[in-house]
């Protein structure tokens, strides 16, 4: 047995008559053979679930449904109840109905065992015939809403009349009928105006009924005709065995670069007609197993069960319904020299279909790993300025298809040929496996028997200690011209375009710092700024050349405090600026400013 | 001016290791260049092996490698070769050599030859 | 790796000859091919490397030339202390290799 709603309303009014009438609840069958007994709870609840009184007000016919006023509720009981209600105004009470079969404890009321009964209370005395409008004669304030379980016996589950106004306006005539289209399964009889299903509702062919409710009001030669929404929602049961889209029960994957824990190396589909069980209940009763194979398997994957709900036509309208994801992940980071191919099974089980049929699935994935070899080019060559300062980055260096790595930890490692050439250095970017080589000795840069600098780059997994070696050829052009006086360290102090292409800075592969002109269009990514190379300073990201010295790019790397017009970078540096950016790494300060108009140049030749 | 020296047993037996050293004089094997070791097969050519830089790390020649250990010993100036698994293929003469600032072989050591037989 | 191929792999000329062995990259090595002399009971020697830089020590009638793939070692009059077997190596890619030698007798 349940309700075939989980609240209703009525009004009440002070000294209303004992034995009015107020309203029907209504429940329906799960199973022909239940007979409903309602029974009231104790108490009146008020504001917040605050226990007002014991009910000694209103009783209910156990057999009927029929909530009615045992005795009047006079100002006096009222103020009673008012004082309890916390200090708040009492304009609503409520009351638990329970069906009696099901031993709910008074402090629960869930649908579909207990519904709550609220009544409006006006402190006066019920209001004349004449002066009700043709929407309180009709309807409650409150529209209802109903909820019919699929599958279930027909039954009654509503009652047109307001009671209170039949029992206290017998002159006013109403009548109700039901607004449908051709073959819906619901009636409203002319004479009860109860209104019932015709037949068991199937939730997998329609989900949502939105009927109108038409009243007409007879008064003397008076007619008036209102009318309500009266939607009806069809409650799952899970009735639909589990299938597979398009009859696809295999997936096959290859795991190569991307080895990193909690990959998602592929991924079956499973769709149940039915949304149940509900969200919060349905990974422990729709389980997926990893059926027992080979140990390594076991530690190696994991299946991860991601339910989504999705909508799907059924004669003309949407329902509801779920696909079941089921994604075979990497338990762990793999060596790059695992090397394996296997079948894993996943058993689906939709644990609460009752059938006809089973609601099992067995899903396969057939999974290849390959082992992964460590490449390089045969030989890199490049070249760097002679006049490049200290952390310039003039270069890449990367084992084939490290880009598309995950989970694989290659370290980069430079040997030179000779000790007073060592210019070089390199760091192993997290971002795509790659190293970057950067400028490390300015000094040997500068030496004459240093005009070619031999490395031998070493890329070693460090998982396996697995390598790849090749030759780096680094050609050093130009000829060294000394920094001006008084230059800064970092590019980024400077302000403005003439003082920062006169300087150089750390990070600068030139030796001289590049102005960024910015687009102006207020708080920018694109703002004006001094950097050592505007290829990798700044792009929204301290890099991990960037990250040895603040100097180098603290418009990316910045942890310090910004001033002026900006959007913070995450987690660090200036992700946008207005106008210019020039920061102090010392101090820990950037400035974004609007851009100056005048440039001193300009103040002189004006003069 | 450097000198190398190789030393170890002219006679190894198949399937066990190979072990040599190369002591250096003249000069400090971590101060600078690369420290190598090269063989060449009875009337063949010569094959480089590997090589220990002055930092530490190694470098060896991808057909070798399975098999070849090179290390060092700071102490007594002096880096090794360890080859295991050894075969009759493996006889040759094996060279200690110093490596230039371009990787072409400044210095070698006069070699010794190393006999695999049973 | 690289294939070296040296030519010839043995050749008999006499004292003051001008002497030309060639040696040839299966890929293009640039400019890094060094030459060596071998001599029995003496230390291998460095004569040339990077295609032409002759080595300190090493007498102005060695020459090398060449680049790309095509390299060759010029001794422009042949000494008697000149006779022995020379190999190139090429010092442009890893792993190094060397060519199979040439040996220069005395006719």
């Known amino acids: 047995l349940y309700f075939s709603r989980d609240a209703y309303w009525e009004k009440l009014y002070v000294d209303q008559a004992a034995g009015t009438p107020l309203l029907y609840v209504h429940a329906l069958r799960d199973a022909p053979e239940e007979v409903p007994s309602f029974r009231l709870g104790q108490h009146l609840y008020g504001t917040y679930r605050t226990r007002l009184h014991e009910n000694n007000w209103i009783c209910i016919q156990e057999d009927t449904g029929l909530l009615y006023l045992n005795r009047s509720l006079d100002h006096s009981s009222w103020e009673k109840l008012s004082v309890r209600n916390r200090g708040f105004p009492l304009l609503t009470v409520y009351l638990k109905v329970f069906l009696s079969p099901t031993s709910l404890r008074e402090g629960e009321c869930q649908w579909p065992g207990c519904a709550r009964v609220y009544f409006s209370f006006f402190n006066t005395s019920f209001p004349a015939c004449s002066s009700l409008k043709p929407r309180e004669l009709c309807f409650p304030e409150t529209r209802p809403s109903f909820r019919i379980r699929e599958n279930r016996p027909p039954g009654t589950f509503h009652q047109f009349r307001l009671l209170p106004v039949q029992f206290l306006c017998p002159n006013i005539s109403v009548a109700y009928r039901l607004l449908e289209g051709e073959g819906l399964p619901f009636r409203c009889a002319p004479d009860s105006l109860e209104v019932s299903t015709r037949w068991a509702l199937d939730r997998e062919q329609r989900e949502k009924y939105e009927l109108v409710a038409v009243c007409t009001v007879h008064a003397g030669a008076r007619e008036e005709v209102v009318m309500v929404p009266f939607p009806v929602t069809v409650y799952d049961e899970d009735d639909s065995a589990p299938t597979f889209p398009a009859g696809v029960d295999t997936a096959s994957a290859v795991v190569e670069f991307k080895r990193k824990e909690d990959t998602v190396v592929a991924t079956l589909r499973v769709f149940d007609a039915d949304v149940v069980p509900a969200s919060g209940e349905l990974v422990r009763r729709y389980t997926s197993t990893l059926l027992p194979g080979d140990t390594w398997a076991q530690q190696t994957f994991r299946v991860e069960h991601w339910p989504n709900e999705t909508s799907v036509q059924a004669n003309g309208s949407f329902v509801r319904a779920t696909v079941h994801d089921y994604r075979l992940v990497l338990n762990r980071n793999l060596s790059i020299s695992e090397n394996r191919t296997m079948q894993l099974a996943v058993l689906v089980n939709d644990s609460d279909f009752q059938g006809p049929g089973a609601g099992v699935l067995l899903l396969h994935f057939n999974v290849s790993v390959l082992p992964v070899s460590l490449h390089l080019p045969s030989t890199y060559s490049l070249s760097v300025s002679r006049r490049a300062r200290r952390f310039a980055q003039i270069g890449k260096v990367c084992v084939e298809n490290c880009q598309a790595f995950s989970g694989i930890n290659v370290q980069y490692k430079l040997h030179s040929s000779g000790a007073n050439c060592s210019t070089l250095g390199v760091v192993t970017s997290a971002e795509d496996t790659s190293g970057i080589l950067f400028v490390n000795d300015t000094k040997a840069l500068r030496r004459p028997k240093c005009a070619e600098l031999h490395y031998m780059v070493v890329a070693t997994d460090q998982q396996t200690s697995r390598q790849a070696q090749a030759q780096l050829l680094v050609t050093v052009e130009g000829s060294y011209v000394a920094e001006e006086a008084g230059c800064p360290l970092s590019c980024a102090v400077s302000k403005r375009r003439l003082e920062c292409e006169e300087c150089g800075g750390l990070g600068s592969p030139t030796g001289r710092c590049e102005w960024r002109q910015g687009d102006g269009k207020g708080i920018t990514r694109n703002f004006s700024t001094c950097s050592p190379s505007t290829k990798t300073c700044p792009d929204g990201h301290c890099d991990v050349v960037e990250t040895q010295d603040i100097n180098i790019c603290p418009q990316d790397c910045l942890r310090g405090s910004i001033v002026g017009g900006h959007e913070p970078g995450e987690p660090r540096g200036i992700k946008a600026g207005y106008g210019t950016c020039n920061c102090f790494p010392e101090e820990e300060k950037c400035f974004c400013e609007p851009e100056d108009i005048q440039d001193p140049l300009c103040d002189e030749l004006c003069r | 001016e450097v000198q190398l020296v190789e030393s170890g047993p002219g006679l190894v037996k198949p399937s066990e290791t190979l072990s040599l050293t190369c002591t250096v004089s003249?000069?400090?094997?971590?101060?600078?260049?690369?420290w190598n070791w090269i063989r060449q097969p009875p009337g063949k050519g010569l094959e480089w092996i590997g090589y220990i830089h002055y930092s530490g790390g190694t470098s060896y020649n991808p057909s070798l490698k399975s098999r070849v250990t090179i290390s060092r010993d700071t102490s007594k100036n002096q880096f090794s070769l360890k080859l295991s698994s050894v075969t009759a293929a493996d006889t040759a003469v094996y060279y200690c050599?110093?490596?230039?600032?371009?990787?072409?072989?400044?210095?070698w050591g006069q070699g010794t030859l190393v006999t695999v037989s049973s | 790796d690289i294939q070296m191929t040296q030519s010839p792999s043995s050749l008999s000329a006499s004292v003051g000859d001008r002497v030309t062995i060639t040696c040839r990259a299966s890929?293009?090595?640039?400019?890094?091919l060094a030459w060596y002399q071998q001599k029995p009971g003496k230390a291998n020697k460095l004569l040339i490397s990077s295609g032409s830089t002759l080595q300190s020590g090493v007498p102005s009638r060695f020459s090398g030339s060449g680049s790309g793939t095509d390299f060759t070692l010029t001794i422009s009059s042949l000494q008697p202390e000149d006779f022995a077997t020379y190999y190139c190596q090429q010092h442009n890619e890893y792993p190094w290799t060397f060519g199979q030698g040439t040996k220069v007798e005395i006719k």
């Open positions: 003249g000069y400090s094997i971590t101060s600078d260049y690369v």
């Open positions: 050599a110093r490596g230039n600032y371009d990787w072409a072989f400044a210095y």
């Open positions: 890929k293009s090595i640039s400019k890094y």
